[in-house]
């Protein structure tokens, strides 16, 4: 049994880090493998993560960490029984993937304006809270070509767009994701999408 693709890990910079790797053949990750992780410092306690399958030869592990802070560094040991398959290290604050925003809502009761709001996935005491920017993806369920991205570079978790920028009388979906430039993070996963029916009054044309 060998590791084909070494573990790569990302952290939500709060309490969960996720590591993924690939084995050289079909593997029952949860019964055959264990990922041990330990805070690098003195005699800190070692923790064990039981991986799950992620495709035939792929494994994923969700590492629960006690309040990740910037000085934390972890050693990672991947074991198959008594055999050490791989040894590495991981600094959560240098491999941040933010949590996905939540509670995406489309408010259609503002005259001819769509107001999209969502929740910041971090509490105010977390450094990322004031450093997230967002991308909002809106697409038509009827027309795959009608697909757009709005970059929200201000801190407020909201976006206003004129309803008239979208087609009237059809259904749209929206989703949002986040990233933080200050930590050069990757993008978060997309939030669950929300659906609405876009309708607005066409401006009266005089001839």
């Amino acid at each position: 049994m060998k590791v084909l693709q070494e573990p790569t890990c990302v952290s939500d910079y709060m309490s969960i880090s996720t590591c993924e790797w690939k084995m050289n053949g079909p593997t029952n990750c949860s019964t055959e493998l264990r990922l041990l992780y330990q805070l690098v410092f003195l005699l800190s306690e070692a923790h064990t993560c039981i991986p799950e399958n992620n495709g035939g030869a792929g494994c994923v592990c969700h590492l629960l960490m006690d309040d990740v802070v910037s000085a934390d560094n972890y050693t990672l040991d991947l074991w198959a029984g008594q055999q050490l398959l791989w040894k590495g290290s991981f600094k959560p604050s240098e491999h941040v993937k933010p949590r996905a925003p939540g509670n995406l809502t489309v408010h259609t009761n503002v005259s001819d304006t769509l107001l999209l709001t969502w929740s910041n996935p971090y509490p105010p005491d977390n450094y990322l809270y004031n450093h997230l920017t967002y991308a909002v993806n809106i697409w038509s369920e009827n027309d795959p070509a009608d697909f757009r991205i709005y970059n929200v570079t201000y801190l407020e978790p909201s976006l206003r767009i004129a309803a008239s920028t979208l087609k009237s009388g059809i259904s749209y979906r929206a989703r949002v994701r986040a990233w933080a430039q200050c930590y050069n993070t990757t993008w978060s996963e997309w939030s669950p999408s929300t659906k609405w029916h876009n309708s607005y009054r066409e401006p009266f044309e005089q001839h």
């Epitope: 910079y13 709060m14 805070l39 690098v40 410092f41 003195l42 800190s44 006690d66 309040d67 990740v68 802070v69 910037s70 000085a71 934390d72 560094n73 604050s93 240098e94 509490p123 005491d125 977390n126 450094y127 990322l128 200050c182």
Partner: antibody, heavy 121, light 107 residues
Framework: QVQLQESGGGLVQPGGSLRLSCAAS????????LTWVRQAPGKGLEWVST????????LYADSVKDRFTISRDNAKNTLYLQMNSLKPEDTAVYYC??????????????WGQGTTVTVSS | DIQMTQSPSSLSASLGDRVTITCQAS??????LAWYQQKSGQAPKLLIY???RLQTGVPSRFSGSGSGTSFTLTISGLETEDLATYYC?????????FGQGTKLEIK
């Protein structure tokens, strides 16, 4: 506003014990890691110990490990430092410190006024 | 452990001068560095974090720069109230380690 108030310092003989307390207010105590930093007379700052927010992880400088124990009571908003087997070189002003954000380690935006520990026979 | 070497250990400057204090890390710490000011008989005060981010309420004459192993604190126009000892602190890894301090005196 954030307030940190240390207490429990005093004069103790070598080999003796003391327990320092740091009463906190003005922030969500249970969300932050908290730290003790000390300063010997006329010397620089030295990191002593940190306890993470939920109290499951404690970290110590080599100079105090196995002698000092950091703990916290999130219900009482209080941080503690139990100091045993004290040595003359532990003589210092002891500060408790809170980081600016819950996931920063040593970016201490708030400090107590300090409590003095003197170890002498 | 990461060693932090601060220089100079003391310096004397005139009001209005531009003052620079440097901190050298024994290994790369990216931008995981904070600067503190400590006046006599007082607790330290955070000036800069993240290598270059100015803490709220700190005068803009203070600035921090550098990354990796070399960092600088600059005071661009020294004022009487800046008489203090300045410390750098690496927050890249445990144990956290301070520089030995720079005592700033006014000529």
């Amino acid at each position: 506003q954030v307030q940190l108030q240390e207490s429990g310092g005093g004069l103790v003989q070598p080999g003796g014990s003391l327990r320092l307390s740091c009463a906190a207010s003005g922030f969500t105590f249970s969300s932050y890691s908290l730290t003790w930093v000390r300063q010997a007379p006329g010397k620089g700052l030295e990191w002593v110990s940190t306890i993470k927010a939920r109290g499951g992880t404690t970290l110590y400088a080599d100079s105090v490990k196995d002698r000092f124990t950091i703990s916290r009571d999130n219900a009482k908003n209080t941080l503690y430092l139990q100091m045993n087997s004290l040595k003359p070189e532990d003589t210092a002003v002891y500060y408790c410190a809170k980081p600016l954000y819950s996931n920063l380690a040593g970016d201490f935006g708030s400090w107590g006024q300090g409590t003095t520990v003197t170890v002498s026979s | 452990d990461i060693q932090m070497t601060q220089s100079p250990s003391s310096l004397s400057a005139s009001l209005g001068d531009r003052v620079t204090i440097t901190c050298q890390a024994s290994q790369s710490i990216s931008s995981y560095l904070a600067w503190y000011q400590q006046k006599s008989g007082q607790a330290p005060k955070l000036l800069i974090y993240g290598g270059s981010r100015l803490q709220t309420g700190v005068p803009s004459r203070f600035s921090g720069s550098g990354s990796g192993t070399s960092f600088t604190l600059t005071i661009s126009g020294l004022e009487t109230e800046d008489l203090a000892t300045y410390y750098c602190l690496q927050v890249y890894s445990w144990p956290l380690t301070f520089g030995q301090g720079t005592k700033l005196e006014i000529k």
